[in-house]
């Protein structure tokens, strides 16, 4: 039950996170005009990854797309790439995780397959979240650098009398949305990986019981392997998976490949 809850919660948190990453990527307010030195401006500038906008005090807003690819700063291109990779990985992760959900039955899909899918989606969410956080952080760093550079030559005097105020940009709402969304996706991914451990098929360990039945003596040995009955019908040791409910003392956890993430 706890595994299903962890997996479900991980899925929901990741879903919210990816929706946030998509929203942040599409938002125009990645950088907004810093009004500290010009609080009386009647024209407000803000920029996104795809276009820049100007909002006038009249309420009229005009946005212009960046219709060049080669003319854009490499950092902006890198941020775009990181956000898109984050979205793509997140979307694939969501698709995979839907089929991995314990509460959804698809044919005769084994728990091992679901565990693998849960782990895969979890890793995808983690990478997706990291991509978003990295993208937003790179953009934020770019803003900070430009902010202090423009502060250094804030006013360029013309003839000693006329002032040209250079527009400075500060963090926009999209950055905060991106950071939070990336964090949520990351957390969701970690939760999926944790859930995967619980979903991983466990080695069933039956207690050593020896009893005499009329006719043939059948011994059950510890280790979850069915011993030969002496009839020669089962010469290979096969793992027995018990899908049913077990009491706590019936279950013994063995390290599996899913334990080390």
């Amino acid at each position: 039950m706890a595994v299903t809850a962890c997996q479900g919660l991980g899925f929901v948190v990741s879903l919210i996170g990816i929706a946030g990453i998509i929203a942040a990527t599409c938002m125009d307010q990645w950088s907004t005009q810093d009004l500290y030195n010009n609080p009386v401006t009647a024209v407000f500038n803000y920029q996104g990854l795809w276009r820049s906008c100007v909002r006038e005090s009249s309420g009229f807003t005009e946005c212009r797309g960046y219709f060049t690819l080669l003319g854009l700063p490499a950092m902006l291109q890198a941020v775009r790439a990181l956000m898109i990779v984050g979205i793509v990985l997140g979307a694939i992760g969501l698709l995979v995780s839907i089929f991995a959900l314990k509460c959804i039955r698809i044919g005769s899909m084994e728990d091992s397959a679901k565990a693998n899918m849960t782990l895969t989606s979890g890793i995808m969410f983690i990478v997706s979240g990291l991509c978003a956080i990295a993208g937003v952080s790179v953009f934020a760093n770019m803003l900070v650098t430009n902010f202090w550079m423009s502060t250094a030559n804030m006013y360029t005097g013309m003839g000693g009398m006329v002032q040209t105020v250079q527009t400075r940009y500060t963090f926009g709402a999209a950055l905060f949305v991106g950071w939070v969304a990336g964090g949520l996706t990351l957390i969701g991914g970690v939760m999926m990986c944790i859930a995967c451990r619980g979903l991983a098929p466990e080695e069933t360990n039956y207690k050593a019981v020896s009893y005499h039945a009329s006719g043939h003596s059948v011994a059950y040995k510890p280790g979850g392997f069915k011993a030969s009955t002496g009839f020669g019908s089962n010469t290979k040791n096969k793992k027995i998976y018990d899908g049913g409910a077990r009491t706590e003392d019936e279950v013994q956890s063995y390290p599996s490949k899913h334990d080390y993430v």
Epitope: V40, A42, V43, S57, R64, T167
Partner: antibody
Framework: EVQLQQSVPELVKPGASVRMSCKAS????????IQWVKQKPGQGLEWIAY????????KYNEKFKGKATLTSDKSASTAYMELSSLTSEDSAVYYC???????????WGQGTLVTVSA | DIVMTQSPSSLTVTAGERVTMTCKSS????????????LTWYQQKPGQPPKLLIY???TRESGVPDRFTGSGSGTDFTLTISSLQSEDLAVYFC?????????FGSGTKLEIK
């Protein structure tokens, strides 16, 4: 067609207050910001303040803070400006105007003449 | 506050003449975000409210004759009337639309010779 109809001229005594109106028609009243401008006889133009009828957000010229108060009535599609503690310096024509592209004022009312005299 | 200085204060002209008036601002009116200059030109005839001619320094308002041309950038702006008509005799004001408070120039009065 956008039209702004302003109230009739006012003759008021010094120290009194006056409230003038600007009735908008030909468009959705909440769509455009309304600006108020002062013009003394034979002189230049002076921006007083604006009001956004959509949310009643206002922005005043520091010079007119405490002198002018802007309000609006959406149901009547009318903007109002009240001038208080009037002196002879307040004798002027007061215009209301709508704002759009480039923060410019494309549509103006005919003006309300306020004369402050004892 | 941004100070708008217009020159000349008055101009005596004849019909058909090319007229040029200037407007200087104490601060740049160029917005880097859209590379537009937030300067507006108005025409005011006696007993009438001002009429919008040009916004964004060079964009002509609809219905304004093409003999009116606005130019300039940053702090120096010009309004040109290519061939003056008798109905163009009026006072012309420039206005800063870039920062509050919006400020107007003192005007240029066109008079007939």
């Amino acid at each position: 067609e956008v039209q702004l109809q302003q109230s009739v001229p006012e003759l008021v005594k010094p120290g009194a207050s006056v409230r003038m109106s600007c009735k908008a028609s030909g468009y959705t009243f909440t769509k455009y910001i309304i600006q108020w401008v002062k013009q003394k006889p034979g002189q230049g133009l002076e921006w007083i303040a604006y009001i956004n009828p959509y949310n009643d957000d206002t922005k005043y010229n520091e010079k007119f803070k405490g002198k002018a108060t802007l309000t609006s009535d959406k149901s009547a599609s009318t903007a109002y400006m009240e001038l208080s503690s009037l002196t002879s310096e307040d004798s002027a024509v007061y215009y209301c105007a709508t704002t759009y592209y480039g923060n410019s004022f494309p549509n103006w009312g005919q003006g309300t003449l306020v004369t402050v005299s004892a | 506050d941004i100070v708008m200085t217009q020159s000349p204060s008055s101009l005596t002209v004849t019909a058909g003449e090319r007229v040029t008036m200037t407007c200087k601002s104490s601060q740049s009116l160029l917005n880097s975000g859209n590379q537009k200059n937030y300067l507006t030109w108005y025409q005011q005839k006696p007993g009438q409210p001002p009429k919008l001619l040009i916004y964004w320094a060079s964009t002509r308002e609809s219905g304004v004759p093409d003999r009116f041309t606005g130019s300039g950038s940053g702090t120096d702006f010009t309004l040109t009337i290519s061939s003056l008509q008798s109905e163009d005799l009026a006072v012309y004001f420039c206005q800063n639309d870039y920062s509050f408070p919006f400020t107007f120039g003192s005007g240029t009065k066109l008079e007939i010779k």
